[in-house]
């Protein structure tokens, strides 16, 4: 490991928000990747343990891929014997940090994503306030989540062929975590924000979706002004 002599120090996690999913349950035959992105000076080394013991490629059929630049461990076509605790150990001469992930390999039937009942919930908000819609997704395989808003085009909610007009507000991307996708935040809402919102979750089996409505009310000052203007 190289020591630049500048800001020497113990290892630290560079993307801790990407490491919050400590329990990973995946169907058999899928690919699993554990990541422990870190930094330090000198640049730390990374090693992996399975159930507290050194983990090497020869320990599993199909081997493993250690991608040191990406601080990752990849296992393809996982089987039930891959279940266990996987620990990354990141260290340099100034210190050591570690993170443990638990892998469960599922053999049950994979299904369409299941969305928690009642979410997202209908919301009523005052003009200028902030709103959050929540969507909880259960899926055997990694789901991809999108938030859609139903819109009108020339006064119509659907196209000539019956296709609903929608705008994609939020979608899975390289810099979006699962937790972030489960929440749609609307700030300083306007009357144009009122309408139907849909949480759409898909996996390799198919899609599922739940919708909710946002009603936007005038601010209280506007209500008062309207009352005064209407009084005789």
């Amino acid at each position: 490991a190289e020591d630049t002599g500048v800001d020497t120090g113990a290892p630290y996690w560079t993307r801790p928000e990407r490491m919050d999913k400590k329990l990973l349950a995946v169907p058999a035959a899928n690919t699993v990747r554990f990541r422990c992105p870190a930094a330090g000076n000198p640049t730390p080394s990374i090693s992996w343990l399975k159930n507290g013991r050194e983990f090497r490629g020869e320990h599993r059929i199909g081997g493993i891929k250690l991608r040191h630049q990406q601080w990752s461990l990849v296992m393809e076509s996982v089987v039930p014997s891959d279940r266990g605790n996987y620990t990354c150990v990141v260290e340099n001469k100034f210190g050591s940090i570690r993170q443990t992930y638990t892998l469960d390999v599922l053999e049950r039937s994979p299904h369409r994503p299941i969305l928690q009942a009642g979410l997202p919930a209908n919301q009523t908000a005052v003009l200028g306030s902030d709103v959050e819609f929540h969507c909880k997704v259960y899926s055997d395989a990694q789901p991809h989540i999108q938030w859609l808003k139903h819109v009108e085009v020339n006064g119509s909610k659907v196209g000539p062929d019956g296709t609903p007009y929608v705008t994609v507000l939020k979608t899975a991307g390289a810099n979006t975590t699962d937790k972030e996708l489960e929440v749609l935040s609307l700030h300083n809402v306007t009357f144009e924000d009122a309408g139907e919102y849909t949480c759409l979750a898909g996996n390799s089996i198919g899609f599922s979706h739940h919708s909710a409505w946002l009603v936007v009310l005038p601010a209280e000052e506007e209500l008062v002004e309207a009352d005064e203007a209407g009084s005789v």
């Epitope: 035959a29 929608v166 759409l200 898909g202 089996i205 198919g206």
Partner: antibody, heavy 124, light 112 residues
């Protein structure tokens, strides 16, 4: 035109291997899950396997688990089915079919597009 | 696995007359999102299956309106209001809610 074209079928002896290909065109292949479905002569349809749009998730029918491997090369717009330890009961027409897309689409989320099929005969 | 059972095995229909095919699933196909994930296909001689109906009752694009799908949870029906000569083929139901995806055994529709 949206199209799927299977190839690689043929006559093979029991215990041998064969690799089927399915070339996709007319749509963004890398945004869709893909399936293999087979049909034995004079019989009904049997689902074989599915692979997610990025290849990270794969599921198989119990009848082929451990013998068949589904894979894809998104740079070549091609789906594959590697069939090992073939048995007489694997004799069938093998179809590839488009599965669920990666994002919002109106209409069915899969099995709207099928290839013409490729025949695999396992016989000694 | 979910078992899909189709009846009848075959059907001989006079042109212009209605036809009805039943399909029963061993488990409910009503999903948490309120949709029922049963699909219907027709397979004409020497061709791959063609999608007719998706999510219980939605006609796929280009499918004539004489085809309709209905049912709930575990019992499903495909109806052809007035059978035409071109409707000859084998009809299959399929559950699309979980893997392994499973098909009914098929119903052969013939013209009298």
């Amino acid at each position: 035109e949206v199209q799927l074209v299977e190839s690689g079928g043929g006559v093979v002896q029991p215990g041998r291997s064969l690799r089927l290909s399915c070339a996709a065109s007319g749509f963004t292949f890398s945004s869709y899950a893909m399936h293999w479905v087979r049909q034995a002569p004079g019989k009904g349809l049997e689902w074989v396997a599915v692979i997610s749009y990025d290849g990270s998730n794969k599921y198989y029918a119990d009848s082929v688990k451990g013998r068949f491997t589904i894979s894809r090369d998104n740079s070549k717009n091609t789906l594959y089915l590697q069939m090992n330890s073939l048995r007489a009961e694997d004799t069938a027409v093998y179809y590839c079919a488009r599965g669920a897309g990666r994002g919002y689409t109106y209409g069915p989320d899969g099995f709207d597009i099928w290839g013409q099929g490729t025949m695999v005969t396992v016989s000694s | 696995d979910i078992v899909m059972t189709q009846t009848p095995l075959s059907l001989s229909v006079t042109p212009g007359q209605p036809a009805s095919i039943s399909c029963t699933s061993s488990r409910s196909l009503l999903h948490s999102d309120g949709k029922t994930y049963v699909y219907w296909y027709v397979q004409k001689s020497g061709q791959p299956p063609q999608l007719l109906i998706y999510e219980l009752s939605n006609r796929f694009s280009g499918v004539p309106d004489r085809f309709s799908g209905s049912g709930s949870r575990t019992d499903f029906t495909l109806k052809i209001s007035r059978v035409e000569a071109e409707d000859v083929g084998v009809y299959y139901c399929m559950q699309y809610i979980e893997a392994p995806l499973t098909f009914g055994g098929g119903t052969k529709v013939e013209i009298k």
